[in-house]
């Protein structure tokens, strides 16, 4: 997990006090137990959330360098429609498996200038990034 | 949704460049069509993610100023098991409804305290916070 | 009227692979659940597995290291392998046709009349 | 795995008689369970479905009831056709199951 440079250093002033990290070290933000493998249109009776679920999910790592948080990871649905809470293996077609998005905030890393415009180090810009978050299984909308 | 004081202001350098908010107004990050009526343990046939699911949720808001974000939305069950697909109203207890947490990244505003100790603004301390984003609706887990 | 009819080898050395074919007459093979149940000599009834649409298949998780059911719907036939048998598996095969409730496999009609696999050296 | 226990294993009867089977689960399968009646040398024979049902061309005098854990298979008037045994098998969840049978002899 890199750490990026100094944010907007000026004259007397520490530079790594601006933007004070964790005292406690970051992992990536990794699902809990992120399994990429063995992964189908199935839920199992064990393993995480997403493979357990009726509406299972694969994760796919979205990683910039330039922005708060570096990695981000975005849900993709692995069937259709929901499985069979009676045998975890086949599709029931009354229910479909729908992605949850979120507006989540996320910090870029952006030049700063100063008020001749020279550049001064680097500023946050605060912005709202679209993630799915899982995927779910849902009653399908009936058109009014 | 309030600003911040400036972030660690430093003589010489504009202090609402430290923090560059984005230029377009941000609205408070409240999860899309939230509705916190007539929820219950139900699969509606219309409406938002959380009240069409199997596995319905509403929202708990949870502010604090001193956190960016300063809202944060809890997702919280509305069932202990899995709403029939077919029926849209009884539960199922072959399946669970579980709540899907995630350590987002998160910045709280901190005094920032100069080389000699005084007060010098406010810095941002980066910290996990867990949150729940929504319910799944999973197989139970089979003990081996 | 479907009608299910079992044929392959009554004999089958251990270690080796068990080979079954069921072949459907009078009726579709699609949106069922096509299985197969066995039965040792002057013993009860045990699910194997399924195999529907042919694509998701089931199986019981205590023969599932060994088990492959397929699906050849041009010839209306599926099919059971069963690997590395051992005299336990000697029985009375049945293929059935697990009946389409609310997209749950529910009960076994009809079935075929059986056929008996010895495992023996 | 959900087990299925039948009492008796056996019964002895006589024509005319009234015959219960019960069939009871390791844990609730809501009204997810099938009868079977099989007869030496034969295949298994669907008579009840969903707990209750009667499957067509079965005889009226056969009636299934029950949900959750218990069940009952009851011949209101035992035939000299129905002498078999006779199995139940649940739907509720996978691996499908039956019970070990109960084989009903002529007295």
């Known amino acids: 997990y890199s750490h990026w440079p100094s944010c907007c250093p000026s004259k007397g002033y520490p530079s790594e006090e601006l933007l004070r990290w964790s005292t406690v070290p970051v992992p990536p933000l990794k699902p809990a137990s992120l399994d990429f493998h063995s992964v189908s249109c199935r839920a199992s009776e064990d393993g995480p959330l997403n493979s357990r679920a009726i509406s299972p999910w694969r994760y796919e790592l979205d990683r910039d360098l330039n922005r708060l948080p570096q990695d981000l990871y975005h849900a993709r649905c692995l069937c259709p429609h929901c499985v069979s809470l009676q045998t975890g293996s086949h599709m029931d077609p009354r229910g479909n498996s729908e992605l949850l998005y979120h507006n989540q905030t996320v910090f870029y890393r952006r030049p700063c200038h100063g008020k001749k415009g020279n550049h001064k180090g680097y500023c946050l810009e605060r912005r709202l990034y679209r993630v799915s978050l899982a995927c779910v299984c849902v009653r399908p909308r009936v058109m009014g | 949704y309030s600003h911040w004081p400036s972030c660690c202001p430093s003589k010489g350098y504009p202090s609402e460049e430290l923090l560059r908010w984005s230029t377009v107004p941000v609205p408070p990050l409240k999860p899309a069509s939230l509705d916190f009526h007539s929820v219950s343990c139900r699969a509606s046939e219309d409406g938002p993610l959380n009240s069409r699911a199997i596995s319905p949720w509403r929202y708990e808001l949870d502010r604090d100023l001193n956190r960016l974000p300063q809202d944060l939305y809890h997702a919280r069950c509305l069932c202990p098991h899995c709403v029939s697909l077919q029926t849209g109203s009884h539960m199922d207890p072959r399946g669970n409804s579980e709540l899907l947490y995630h350590n987002q990244t998160v910045f709280y505003r901190r005094p920032c305290h100069g080389k000699k100790g005084n007060h010098k603004g406010y810095c941002l301390e980066r910290r996990l916070y867990r949150v729940s984003l929504a319910c799944v609706c999973v197989r139970p887990r089979v003990m081996g | 009227q479907v009608q299910l009819q079992e044929s392959g080898p009554g004999l089958v050395k251990p270690s080796e692979t068990l080979s079954l074919t069921c072949t459907v007459s009078g009726g579709s093979i699609s949106n069922y659940f096509w299985s197969w149940i066995r039965q040792p000599p002057g013993k009860g009834l045990e699910w194997i597995g399924f195999n529907y649409n042919s694509g998701s298949t089931n199986y019981n998780p205590s023969l599932k290291s060994r088990v492959t059911i397929s699906v050849d719907t041009s010839k209306n036939q599926f099919s059971l392998k069963l690997s590395s048998v051992t005299a336990a598996d000697t029985a009375v095969y049945y293929c059935?046709?697990?009946?389409?409730?609310?997209?749950?496999?529910?009960?076994?009609?009809?079935w075929g009349q059986g056929t008996l696999v010895t495992v023996s050296s | 795995d959900i087990q299925m226990t039948q009492s008796p294993s056996s019964l002895s009867a006589s024509v005319g008689d009234r015959v219960t089977i019960t069939c009871r689960a390791s844990?609730?399968?809501?009204?997810?369970l099938n009868w079977y009646q099989q007869k030496p040398g034969k295949a298994p024979k669907l008579l009840i479905y969903?707990?209750?049902s009667l499957q067509s061309g079965v005889p009226s005098r056969f009636s299934g009831s029950g949900s959750g854990t218990d069940f009952t298979l009851t011949i209101s008037s035992l035939q000299p056709e129905d002498f078999a045994t006779y199995y139940c098998q649940q739907s509720y969840l996978t691996p499908l199951t039956f019970g070990g049978g109960t084989k009903v002899e002529i007295k």
């Open positions: 844990q609730s399968i809501s009204s997810y």
């Open positions: 969903a707990a209750s």
């Open positions: 059935a046709r697990g009946y389409n409730w609310n997209y749950e496999i529910a009960w076994f009609d009809p």
